[in-house]
């Protein structure tokens, strides 16, 4: 069963700046990745970025830079200033859509005890799995 991992890290240089990394552990080729915050995209979450392998990347504030790291993983840097900036307990979710298999998503937040600049290992954290 494919899985998705999500890693959230606070930048040491900018304490209100976050980096979200997500990856897809599966054999399918990715058609679209959607990153949201405040919950999954279909359950009240707000879209931060949409990444398409051919048609490019769309992003919305406070997203600053979304990019592909590999064919099956992405990263997103969030601005740390302004009313819409994330806080330490914000939940971030990533949804990977693979055709024709379907979509898998997972959510994560900053580890409670994490120091700025220290990253949690990318452990699989699926919230929805195939039956």
């Amino acid at each position: 069963t494919p899985e998705v991992w999500v890693q959230v890290r606070m930048e040491a240089t900018e304490l209100s700046s976050f980096t979200i990394r997500c990856g897809f552990l599966g054999s399918g080729s990715i058609s679209l990745v959607t990153v949201s915050w405040g919950g999954p995209n279909g359950a009240g979450g707000t879209t931060l970025a949409v990444l398409h392998p051919e048609r490019g990347i769309r992003q919305w504030a406070p997203a600053r830079q979304a990019r592909w790291e590999t064919q099956s993983s992405i990263s997103l840097i969030l601005e740390g200033s302004g009313a819409s900036s994330p806080c330490a307990n914000t939940t971030f979710c990533c949804k990977f859509a693979s055709f024709p298999e379907g979509s898998w998503e997972a959510c994560g937040s900053l580890p409670p005890s994490s120091d700025p600049g220290l990253s949690a290992p990318p452990t699989p954290a699926p919230i929805l799995r195939a039956d």
Partner: antibody
Framework: EVQLVESGGGLVKPGGSLRLSCAAS????????MSWVRQAPGKCLELVSA????????YYLDTVKGRFTISRDNAKNSLYLQMNSLRAEDTAVYYC?????????????WGQGTLVTVSS | DIVMTQSPDSLAVSLGERATINCKAS??????VAWYQQKPGQPPKLLIY???HRFTGVPDRFSGSGSGTDFTLTISSLQAEDVAVYFC?????????FGCGTKLEIK
Amino acid sequence: EVQLVESGGGLVKPGGSLRLSCAASGFTFSSYHMSWVRQAPGKCLELVSAINSNGINTYYLDTVKGRFTISRDNAKNSLYLQMNSLRAEDTAVYYCARHEDYYGFAMDYWGQGTLVTVSS
Amino acid sequence: DIVMTQSPDSLAVSLGERATINCKASQSVSNDVAWYQQKPGQPPKLLIYYVSHRFTGVPDRFSGSGSGTDFTLTISSLQAEDVAVYFCHQAYRSPWTFGCGTKLEIK
């Protein structure tokens, strides 16, 4: 304007074969996933087969596995469904449809359909 | 497979009145739900994608809502041209599956 035009349907005896074609125009065919969906009289819509944009990944409905083969020719902007060992229960209107990644794989454009009748 | 159960099977509504069609998924399908309209002798046409987004050219009297397993298509003020069969569809997990349709008629 996006257009999908199916052809190749007709009357065939049980055990026979047909090859359906779908000619695409008005969009970059090679960038889109495609499917064949069928609708038997009084029955639900049924996804028969799907193929991703580069033709590598495919899906088949369990009841057609081993009998139907989906393929595409991106140079010719065409989608195909080779149907072998046809059965009476394969009788339906067959539609080709385009999937839009940005719409959660919803099928945003459909052809007019081609009727396949399997009867002795 | 994810089963999409539509209700009611048929619906008669007066012109100008509200029509509501429901769709229940056998498991969560996130927001990967679409609605299609099909008129006799025609292919299905996309109305709504991602639960609540109207496709290009679709009148704003059509709206979609719901999350998880329960979804609704609403026509706020029925027009004569809305007489058709409406299908829900999930593209969350393969195999993509459809509801069996709701036939909408004028009362």
